[in-house]
């Protein structure tokens, strides 16, 4: 990075002073500063000297020294103030041109930093700035009007307070040009249209731009339509609107409609589709399977997609049984509209209870009639198990009943010792019952199965365990005989524990 002598970032001198600014670099260096009189420039190898022996207020400005050969592109700067009591401002340009929303720098440089506290920006002839003019001041650069607007295209003066009076700079003309950011903005409404043959329809194509010079047209299946245009100007934008009114639609009106607008920046287009139908329609569908299985205590959302024209006149969710006559709470039913002709209806069933299994039907109605979509909801339960001792055909038998959904599988275990649950180390014998007898199997209910284990002699100090499992979980019941030779005693002489 080059180095400037004197070694200060800013310098205050009086008019008529001799000022010598020296820049030293590793290679050749170059000075860049405001265009002003009286400077002489001479180079001496790796240094360059900018000198004046008669500094004036016009020499006020920032002088930057760069090293063209430096790959890092480093530079050093020094700001020179030539404080002239008669000239508080050095104006570097009398016309500034920016685009809207850019910052506009009005380059009036203060010649004496002491005056900074009393500076302000005014319009010519002492008129105040327009409301909402947001500006800031830098003694090195001047006034910046932030995010300039077209309406701020005015003549400005910089004002400094000197000895109690305001001293103005020469005027600076600001020209704020409208930005044409691209092709005009477009809207085409509706985004989709359905009508029954013979009904009326309206399609509106509108375009807007900051500049009046743009064209807009509406086309149907690549044919440009001759439609009268309405023009307007508001919110600082020009608008052109084309409205297509159809009193009685027919099938030839159906198809693709495109709204196209163009200006010097290019072209924008947007499309919609118009469908003409013979009669009203109402279609119900679901992305879900209509047969649902959910574990008891969990939640489920049932979703129905509705496609309809004309709009729905009524809809509701109904519980069709078999457990109770309760109906879904309205607060659990939710409707969302995807677009004009498609809707999604959701029924939320949180923490499902046994009595909530069964059929749920969504019904909807429009002028085309009624439609219904029915879901069948079966609840899954982990097995519940119980074991009793009984005699069947004179043989001592352990009878295990297991109830759950899906249908449980049954396994018998015999193990040593008295225990609530057999562990691997204690197991003496294992019997799988691949086909337990189904006692009950009704829709939406648990399946109850029964498994029999014939035991000639109930061994003392042993445990008989019935285990049942399904996809939800498992359950077990341990049967513990109390006395030896129990096979000769009736069942009530034995204790069984779950």
């Amino acid at each position: 990075i080059p180095v400037i002598e004197p070694s200060v970032p800013e310098l205050v001198v009086k008019p008529g002073a001799t000022v010598t600014l020296r820049c030293v670099g590793n290679g050749s260096v170059e000075w860049d500063g405001p265009p002003s009189p009286h400077w002489t420039l001479y180079s001496d190898g790796s240094s360059s000297i900018l000198s004046t022996n008669n500094a004036t207020f016009q020499n006020t400005g920032t002088y930057r020294c760069t090293e063209p050969g430096d790959p890092l592109g480093g530079s050093a700067a020094i700001h020179l103030y030539v404080k002239d009591p008669a000239r508080p401002w050095n104006v570097l340009a009398q016309e500034v041109v920016v685009f809207e929303d850019q910052d506009a720098l009005l380059p009036c440089l203060l010649t004496d930093p002491v005056l900074e506290a009393g500076v302000s920006l005014v319009r010519v002839r002492g008129r105040p700035l327009m409301r909402h003019t947001n500006y800031s001041f830098s003694p090195w650069h001047g006034f910046t009007i932030h995010r300039a607007k077209f309406i701020q295209s005015q003549d400005y003066q910089c004002s400094a307070l000197m000895g109690g009076r305001k001293v103005m700079s020469i005027s600076i003309r600001l020209k704020v040009q409208k930005v044409i950011p691209g092709p005009p903005a477009l809207t085409l409404v509706p985004a989709e249209l359905v009508r029954i043959r013979g009904e009326a329809a309206q399609i509106v194509c509108s375009a807007s731009s900051v500049d009046v010079n743009f064209d807009v047209f509406l086309q149907h299946n690549n044919t440009k339509l001759a439609i009268p245009q309405q023009s307007d100007f508001h919110n600082n934008r020009y608008q052109k609107v084309l409205t297509l009114n159809l009193d009685q639609v027919d099938f030839q009106h159906a198809g693709n409609y495109s709204c196209v607008a163009s200006n010097v920046q290019g072209k924008h287009s947007t499309s919609m589709f118009f469908r003409v139908v013979e009669s009203a329609y109402l279609n119900l569908s679901s992305e879900q399977n209509l047969i649902q299985e959910v574990t008891v205590g969990e939640g489920l959302n049932l979703k129905v997609m509705v496609e309809a024209y004309p709009g729905l006149q009524g809809f509701n969710w109904t519980y069709l049984g078999p457990f109770s006559d309760h109906q879904p709470e309205p607060k659990l039913a939710n409707a969302t509209t995807k677009d004009t002709y498609r809707h999604t209806f959701t029924l939320s069933l949180p923490r499902l209870k046994p009595s909530e299994a069964g059929r749920y039907s969504f019904l909807a109605r429009n002028p085309g009639g009624w439609r219904a979509l029915t879901f069948e909801l079966t609840l899954r339960y982990p097995p519940e198990v119980s074991v009793i001792w009984t005699f069947i055909n004179g043989s001592g038998t352990l009878l295990c009943a297991a109830s759950g959904y899906p249908q449980p599988n049954v396994t018998w275990l015999q193990c040593s010792g008295h225990t609530d649950r057999c562990d691997e180390a204690q197991v003496l014998q294992v019997w799988d019952d691949p086909y337990p007898e189904v006692l009950s199997q009704e829709p939406f209910h648990k399946v109850t199965v029964q498994s029999l284990l014939t035991v000639e002699t109930l061994e003392h100090n042993q445990t008989y365990e019935c285990r049942a499992h399904n996809s939800v979980g498992s359950g077990s019941w341990a049967f513990i005989p109390i006395s030896a030779g129990a096979h000769t005693h009736p069942p009530d002489e034995f204790l069984f524990t779950p």
Epitope: P6, S7, P9, E10, L11, V13, A17, T20, A117, P139
Partner: antibody, heavy 112, light 106 residues
Framework: QVQLQESGPGLVKPSETLSLTCTVS????????WTWIRQPPGKGLEWIGY???????NYNPSLKSRVTISVDTSKNQFSLKLSSVTAADTAVYYC??????WGQGTLVTVSS | DIQMTQSPSTLSASVGDRVTITCRAS??????LAWYQQKPGKAPKLLIY???SLESGVPSRFSGSGSGTEFTLTISSLQPDDFATYYC????????FGQGTKVEIK
Amino acid sequence: QVQLQESGPGLVKPSETLSLTCTVSGGSISSSYWTWIRQPPGKGLEWIGYIHYSGSTNYNPSLKSRVTISVDTSKNQFSLKLSSVTAADTAVYYCARGFDYWGQGTLVTVSS
Amino acid sequence: DIQMTQSPSTLSASVGDRVTITCRASQSISSWLAWYQQKPGKAPKLLIYMASSLESGVPSRFSGSGSGTEFTLTISSLQPDDFATYYCQQYNSYWTFGQGTKVEIK
């Protein structure tokens, strides 16, 4: 009228970092440039460095490896940090705007 | 580094005297020199900048001259308030101060 006021600990242990703050009143720190200068007891003045409101800095080459000057425009303050101090850093430390307005100075003693 | 040498180190003078202090730079510093006055326990006060420009509010009995390597500070008629230590400072390449000149009552 611009006024400057130095603040910070009066005693710093050897090898630690000396930290001072200069608060500017009666003017904005977002203009001009801001300097630190020191004066050992009974001796002459030594320039430490300066910072311009834009953030650019310039330091005395003999102190450069140990010095950091920074500016906080929101508080209208600038500060000095001098690391790895020794007894030779004992001095009255002045802050100044350029070289026209000076603070009254604060004595910092480096001692264990 | 640029060295600044002031002479004399001490100067005895009376009220009304014309006093001259010299400052010599080890290499050319153009006109980038300032003069300060410091009283005991106080901060230095800027008198002259750019070798000869009088700081506003400083009495006109103070003047500066010189360029390149030789500079002088002159007090045309010494006043009681002027007894103090005076420092020169170059700001051409980094900043360095002279060792100071003490002006005391004769």
